[in-house]
């Protein structure tokens, strides 16, 4: 078989047309995705067969494998076929679409597999990530096939950047069936204990009647054996349990505890392990950062969350301005601390329909007999801006003034704008910004006051207009982090007797 162009890899332009030719000594055909696209087949005078595949108006979706193969392999010794891979870099196509069959990968043993996320451009950098994580995995990538390696029983996504846009592939799910006729589970009453407390582990086998348990644990390595107890839980199906109990744990008892179960009838075995940590004394540790300044919006609900690790379980208290907080009967404050794993806790303070008076200094304290931590932050209540007053006056000096007063938290910015053609404004004509350039026939004076009791800023801004020769729509817009408000007033020239 002779293919022109020979490839094995071509990069073609989007929207272009391209011709592929294949010839051989017997009828030949082009195949794409196990189908035969429309093509022109011919037989030359010298007995050579050929097929011409014309690709028109190429898009990224034309990226992929193209095969030329003998159309009728009867009587031919060889099942020779030529493979060509075409890339059509197309910024509108992120990852090439997959069939459902390609998104779910099933296996029974540890073997190399390919996660088939493919892009249209061989120059793109593609990375592989666990679906729940951000770290790129060190797995080799082939632009024609995808990522190949030995993968754990997880879900994965591929990422690339096209221009300044990050693109994610569909999720790929790796399912590994662990073929074992023994189903072993190991658990501990606690995986963290203080020295002097007890370690108790259980190893349970379901569905097997004749099994042998063998434990390995740190103490065993130093020759100090512990006799496990085996009992039967007469459930259906059969449950057999081995209990390993170590009283008065020492620091050296930290480590991996493994339960190995063998079944002699079919010579099957399985093992499970669990890690135990023995600590000198209890601990409380904060996890993650909580900024020293937190914000809440007036009349909205806000939950403040602190995550920490502790053993043994701690007492948690919340304070505001050094006074203890409790769940309020009016339902304005809700406190909750929940266990999200054996030693991890989330404590939440929820302020319902936040009020100005709830601004202040908050502290969470978690403690037990061995340790304590505390975390403090200032809570600022943000208040959306509102324009309280917009008035126009024309003192004897001949100039005209417009005064705008408003409040909000954080401090509002003020923007003055005007529109001269009342009929076309503001739909057709954008308003002109005022007071920020020397050319404007206007002057601006702005004062800001902080009102301690209301915990918000007041802005008063006065705009002086020198020559108003026709009616003018003047707009005052106040804006802060949580909103904006606008009012407008029509300013008419002195000479006009009415408003």
């Amino acid at each position: 078989l002779v293919v022109t162009p020979p490839g094995p890899e071509l990069v073609l332009n989007v929207s272009s047309t391209f011709v592929l030719t294949c010839s051989g000594s017997a009828p030949v055909v082009w195949e794409r995705m196990s189908q035969e696209p429309p093509q022109e087949m011919a037989k030359a005078q010298d007995g050579t067969f050929s097929s011409v595949l014309t690709l028109t108006n190429l898009t990224g979706l034309d990226t992929g494998e193209y095969f030329c193969t003998h159309n009728d392999s009867r009587g031919l010794e060889t099942d020779e076929r030529k493979r060509l891979y075409i890339f059509v870099p197309d910024p509108t196509v992120g990852f090439l679409p997959n069939d459902a069959e390609e998104l779910f990968i099933f296996l029974t043993e540890i073997t190399e597999i390919t996660i088939p996320c493919r892009v249209t451009d061989p120059q793109l950098v593609v990375t592989l990530h666990e679906k729940k994580g951000d770290v790129a995995l060190p797995v080799p990538y082939d632009h024609q096939r995808g990522f190949s390696g030995i993968f754990e029983d997880r879900s994965y996504i591929c990422k690339t950047t096209i221009g300044d846009r990050e693109v994610d592939s569909d999720a790929y799910y790796v399912y590994r069936l662990q073929v074992s006729s023994i189903n072993v589970s190991v658990n501990a009453v606690q995986t963290v204990v203080r020295q002097g407390e007890n370690i108790t582990l259980m190893c349970i086998v379901i569905g097997n009647e004749v099994v042998n348990f063998e434990w390995t644990y740190p103490r065993k390595e130093s020759g100090r054996l512990v006799e496990p107890v085996t009992d039967f839980l007469l459930d259906m199906p059969y449950h057999i349990r081995s209990i390993l109990h170590i009283p008065s744990a020492e620091l050296e008892d930290s480590g991996t505890y493994t339960c190995n179960v063998t079944e002699s009838v079919n010579d099957h075995q399985d093992e499970k392990a669990i890690n135990i940590t023995v600590v000198e004394s209890g601990y409380v540790r904060l996890l993650g950062e909580v900024g020293t300044l937190q914000f809440a919006e007036l009349h909205r609900s806000r939950t403040l969350q602190v995550v920490f690790e502790a053993y043994p379980p701690p007492t948690v208290l919340w304070f505001k301005d050094n006074r203890t907080l409790g769940d309020s009967s009016a339902g304005e404050i809700a406190l909750s601390t929940r266990n999200v794993s054996e030693t991890r806790y989330v404590s939440e303070l929820t302020l319902v329909r936040v009020k100005v008076a709830e601004a202040g200094h908050y502290t969470m304290r978690a403690f037990h007999e061995d340790a304590e931590v505390q975390l403090s932050f200032q809570l600022q209540i943000n208040v959306p801006v509102r324009v309280l007053e917009l008035s126009e006056s024309h003192p004897d000096s001949g100039e005209q003034t417009v005064r705008c007063r408003g409040r909000g938290m954080p401090q509002p910015n003020i923007i003055w704008s005007a529109c001269r053609d009342l009929k076309r404004c503001p739909r057709e004509l954008p308003p002109t910004l005022l007071g920020n350039s020397s050319e404007e026939e206007s002057q601006l004076e702005t004062n800001v006051t902080y009102w301690e009791e209301e915990q918000e800023f007041e802005v008063v801004s006065t705009l002086r207009l020198q020559h108003v020769d026709r009616p003018l729509s003047v707009r005052c817009t106040l804006r802060n982090a949580v909103g904006q408000d606008t009012q407008e007033v029509i300013v008419v020239p002195h000479s006009l007797p009415f408003k």
Partner: nanobody
Framework: QMQLVQSGAEVKKPGASVKVSCKAS????????IQWVRQAPGQGLEWIGG????????NYAQRFQGRVTINADESTSTVYMEMSSLRSEDTAVYYC?????????WGQGTLVTVSS
Amino acid sequence: QMQLVQSGAEVKKPGASVKVSCKASGYTFTDYYIQWVRQAPGQGLEWIGGILPILKTPNYAQRFQGRVTINADESTSTVYMEMSSLRSEDTAVYYCATHGGDRSYWGQGTLVTVSS
């Protein structure tokens, strides 16, 4: 803990149909895709199809299209796989499986034997 429990073994004659059930527990049933996979003696795993119960629209592998029906019953948290026109090559252990994102969970398997 996610758990899948399948119906018991079946013996069928060629040309007949079989319906295997998979009851889910330990998670929000509607939110996770449930797959059906089979393993014939001495072979690897072969995907049959799957369903996301909240969408109710199943996906099928091309080679089983038209011969397999997968559906979900939210009231009992159960997914069913029915295969018709059985032939001897359909003798296999049929598994349902779901994925929690950080690992997969499997039913115990249902042996379907097709024999005259």
